[in-house]
Amino acid sequence: DVNEAPQFSQHVFQAKVSEDVAIGTKVGNVTAKDPEGLDISYSLRGDTRGWLKIDHVTGEIFSVAPLDREAGSPYRVQVVATEVGGSSLSSVSEFHLILMDVNDNPPRLAKDYTGLFFCHPLSAPGSLIFEATDDDQHLFRGPHFTFSLGSGSLQNDWEVSKINGTHARLSTRHTEFEEREYVVLIRINDGGRPPLEGIVSLPVTFCSCVEGSCFRPAGHKHHHHHH
């Protein structure tokens, strides 16, 4: 009669929970039985983000910190079942916590838009295209961002128009701009639940051009034209 290690009821335990659950919420549980009928003590291994705790008697798993789907989902940890008393033999199983997305990331620019410029003086109103993104999950369809100017004072000089759910066009309303950098604030709304808004800045330079690029004194890089 050889003492055997505890046996988990499943190789992998899986649970699904919203990423915004309150700290202390039960997010799942595991069960194992000992062939000799001994009690089981449960513990976690590999909880690298410090998100979970397990009740060592019942095998229930609770959140102990805010969860974040954007940090990676599913979140995988190992569960160890050790027999209480006896030879303290143990077995290992997996617990996978699938985090359901909550709209908790405001929109932002999809890339670095430094270096945008128009050749000065403008011969006609100009425009440039920019792209927005966010880190939330967009099932079945892409993001549906809406775009507007970040402050009323910009409306005399600029207008923003939506191209699609992720792209918009920033256009000048006239040609009378000074030879300098303008910082254009754009408000991007993700239309989610709850809707989140990001205000981003697009730095646009009006500069003298040489062969289609901004002329800079020696030692400065040439920038490419973006209209």
Partner: antibody, heavy 117, light 108 residues
């Protein structure tokens, strides 16, 4: 026979800590979980938490998390429960109990802890 | 947390009576982890019944337990003088373990 023998009554001032011991005899402490349950005068039973003496794993009731510490000394077959930041409502009889399959089959005789200024 | 509610809170009965105490859980409890304890004044609780219906060692057969889900009962078929005490149900299906508020059984 199997028994759990607890330390004697304690009188403490508010804000102090108390450490109650529970010595197992007739069996090896590491063979079972040890639980702590308290009972305020004239009141019912309240589970405080549990410890597995084999590796020190513990589970505390949310109400006591941060104030209670359960430990064991396997060399003396003794479990301990320390409760800090005592207040008058912590006046109670504190019991240790051994569990098997989550039922408490052996209980200590209880330790009266009085918190009074 | 699972709340355990016992009824009645107190009960007067005579020797030889059949007595039933009920325990209702606020959510479903595994019958494997439902216990009953007896406590006499100045003494530690004593295990009577474990896993809903199993008699603990040395407990007389006049005690019995039954139930499932959220409703459980403790029955004493014929009260004896030594049975006058306070009775508690306990669940450990889910953490934290919780007890009923107790039922005090007194002599009529």
């Amino acid at each position: 026979q199997v028994q759990l023998v607890q330390s004697g009554a304690e009188v403490k001032k508010p804000g102090a800590s108390v450490k109650v011991s529970c010595k197992a005899s007739g069996y090896t402490l590491t063979s079972n979980n040890i639980h702590w349950v308290r009972q305020a005068p004239g009141q019912g039973l309240e589970w405080m938490g549990a410890i597995y003496p084999g590796n020190g794993d513990n589970s505390y009731a949310q109400k006591f998390t941060g104030r209670v510490t359960m430990t064991v000394d396997t060399s003396t077959n003794t479990a301990y429960m320390e409760l800090s930041s005592l207040r008058s409502e912590d006046t109670a009889v504190y019991y240790c109990a051994r569990s098997f399959r989550r039922y408490f089959d052996v209980w200590g005789q209880g330790t009266m802890v009085t918190v009074s200024s | 947390d699972i709340q355990m509610t016992q009824s009645p809170s107190s009960l007067s009965a005579s020797v030889g009576d059949r007595v039933t105490i009920t325990c209702r859980a606020s959510s479903s409890v595994s019958s494997s982890y439902l216990q009953w304890y007896q406590q006499k004044p100045g003494k530690a609780p004593k295990l009577l019944i474990y896993s809903t219906s199993n008699l603990a060692s040395g407990v007389p057969s006049r005690f019995s337990g039954s139930g499932s889900g959220t409703d459980f009962t403790l029955t004493i078929s014929s009260l004896q003088p030594e049975d006058f005490a306070t009775y508690y149900c306990q669940q450990y299906s889910s953490s934290p373990s919780t007890f009923g508020q107790g039922t005090k059984l007194e002599i009529k």
